[in-house]
Interface confidence: low
C-alpha cells in the first residue's frame, strides 16, 4: 500500500497522519503523534457522544422541561442522548419532542379512532350511520345506537350522529 | 508497552508447510497493519508482506505468492503467517514487525522465530 | 522493484569520529504528499532490527540525536555525528513507497 492520503473506518487523517477516533462516550484530548495514540477522556455526568468522533466537547443532554409538559422517558447514558416524552394527557409535537400539547378531544357527532400517544395526536373519525357520540373525548369511541326491537321497544325519536335513539313502548290496540 | 511475541523454533522438512503466530500487546491491534520480514543466516532483510487486522487485507511480496498466508485473530490480538512447500533455502528468522501508520515505517519488531528446513 | 544499494557494505570507524552511510535508491522514494518514503534501521548480533530514522530524517522515538538523516530524491545518507560502542551493529535503509518493500543490502560498522 501506498502512503496514506485517507484513512480507513473509526480514523481520521491529520497532519498527513491516520489517527484514531475516540469512541462513542468518549472526546477527544489530543491527536496521536508519531509516538502516542491518539488520547481520548470519558464525557462527563449529563454529557454524551453517540458515534466514533474527534470532538473536543462532549454534548449536553437533553433536558426534558416540565413546564413543556415533558418527562424523561428513556434516562441518557455517556453514549445516548436523553429521550424525553410528554405526560398523561399530552403529545410531542415534533418527532425531537421538544414540546408538548394536549391530546386533541373528538367533538360530539366524532369519535376516537386511534388514542393518542406520547407522539402522536388523537385520530377522530366521523360516527357512521347506527353510531353517535354526544360528549367531547379524547377517549370515547362511537356508541352503537340503541336496539329497542331487542327491548321490545319502539324507536319514538331516531338518533342522529350525536344522539341516541329514544325508545319507547309499543301501541296497544284497545279493545 | 508495545510487544510482539513470537512463537518458538521450528525444524521442517522439505515440502512440509510452518505456521508462526505473533501475539500483540500494548495496543490496539486493528489500528495497524502487521508486516513479515524474513533473514536467512548471514543474509539481509526481506519483506514477505503485511495484513490489515481490520478488514484482513493482504499485500504479499510477489515472490512469496501462491506460498505465503498471512492472517489474523482479533479476539486474542494474534497475526499469523503461514509459508507452504518448504525448501532449504527457505531456512531462515522469521519476524512480524508493525507498520506505524504514522511513521510507515517498521516501528516494532517481535523477537524473531528460527525456521529450518533440512531433510 | 525498487533497489536500494548501500555503500560501503563495511566501515570501521574510530570512537568519537563521523559514521557516514549511503542509500541510493533505483527510483524515486518522494511521494505526492511531499514526504520521502526512506527509513534507517540498526540490528545487533541476535536482535531483531530497531528502527533509527522514519520518513528521512525524523528520529524515531528514544534514538540519540547523534543519528541523522539526511537525503533527497533517490540519494540517502544516515550519520552518525560521534560514534560510540553501542553503535557498532548492521544498518539497512527501507523504503515503502512501492510495493514490495524493499531493504538496501545493509552496511556492517565497526570500531577502527
Known amino acids: 500500500p501506498e502512503p496514506p492520503t485517507a484513512c480507513r473506518e473509526k480514523q481520521y487523517l491529520i497532519n498527513s497522519q491516520c489517527c484514531s477516533l475516540c469512541q462513542p462516550g468518549q472526546k477527544l484530548v489530543s491527536d496521536c503523534t508519531e509516538f502516542t495514540e491518539t488520547e481520548c477522556l470519558p464525557c462527563g455526568e449529563s454529557e454524551f457522544l453517540d458515534t466514533w468522533n474527534r470532538e473536543t466537547h462532549c454534548h449536553q443532554h437533553k433536558y426534558c422541561d416540565p413546564n413543556l409538559g415533558l418527562r424523561v422517558q428513556q434516562k441518557g447514558t455517556s453514549e445516548t442522548d436523553t429521550i424525553c416524552t410528554c405526560e398523561e394527557g399530552w403529545h410531542c409535537t415534533s418527532e425531537a419532542c421538544e414540546s408538548c400539547v394536549l391530546h386533541r378531544s373528538c367533538s360530539p357527532g366524532f369519535g376516537v379512532k386511534q388514542i393518542a400517544t406520547g407522539v402522536s395526536d388523537t385520530i377522530c373519525e366521523p360516527c357512521p350511520v347506527g353510531f353517535f357520540s354526544n360528549v367531547s373525548s379524547a377517549f370515547e369511541k362511537c356508541h352503537p345506537w340503541t336496539s329497542c326491537e331487542t327491548k321490545d321497544l319502539v324507536v319514538q325519536q331516531a338518533g342522529t350522529n350525536k344522539t341516541d335513539v329514544v325508545c319507547g313502548p309499543q301501541d296497544r290496540l284497545r279493545a | 508497552q508495545v510487544q510482539l511475541v513470537q512463537s518458538g523454533a521450528e525444524v521442517k522438512k522439505p515440502g512440509a508447510s510452518v505456521k508462526v503466530s505473533c501475539k500483540a500487546s500494548g495496543y490496539t491491534f486493528t489500528g495497524y497493519n502487521m508486516n513479515w520480514v524474513r533473514q536467512a543466516p548471514g543474509q539481509g532483510l526481506e519483506w514477505m508482506g503485511n495484513i490489515d487486522p481490520y478488514y484482513g487485507n493482504t499485500n504479499y511480496n510477489q515472490k512469496f505468492k501462491g506460498r505465503v498466508t498471512m492472517t489474523t485473530d482479533t479476539s486474542t490480538s494474534t497475526a499469523y503467517m503461514e509459508l507452504r512447500s518448504l525448501r532449504s533455502d527457505d531456512t531462515a528468522v522469521y519476524y512480524c514487525?508493525?507498520?506505524?501508520?504514522?511513521?510507515?515505517?517498521?516501528?516494532?519488531w517481535g523477537q524473531g522465530t528460527t525456521v529450518t528446513v533440512s531433510s | 522493484d525498487i533497489v536500494l544499494t548501500q555503500s560501503p557494505d563495511s566501515l570501521a570507524v574510530s570512537l568519537g569520529e563521523r559514521a557516514t552511510i549511503n542509500c541510493r535508491a533505483s527510483q524515486s522514494l518522494v511521494h505526492s504528499n511531499a514526504n520521502t518514503y526512506l527509513h534507517w534501521y540498526q540490528q545487533k548480533p541476535g536482535q531483531p532490527p530497531k528502527l533509527l530514522i522514519y520518513?528521512?530524517?525524523n528520529r524515531f522515538f528514544g534514538v540519540p540525536d547523534r543519528f541523522s538523516g539526511s537525503g533527497s530524491g533517490t540519494d540517502f545518507t544516515l550519520t552518525i555525528s560521534s560514534l560510540q560502542a553501542e553503535d557498532v551493529a548492521v544498518y539497512y535503509c527501507?523504503?515503502?513507497?512501492?510495493?514490495?518493500?524493499?531493504f538496501g543490502q545493509g552496511t556492517k560498522l565497526e570500531i577502527k
Open positions: 520518513k528521512l530524517t
Open positions: 514487525a508493525r507498520l506505524g501508520l504514522q511513521l510507515y515505517a517498521l516501528d516494532y
Open positions: 527501507q523504503q515503502s513507497i512501492h510495493v514490495p518493500w524493499t
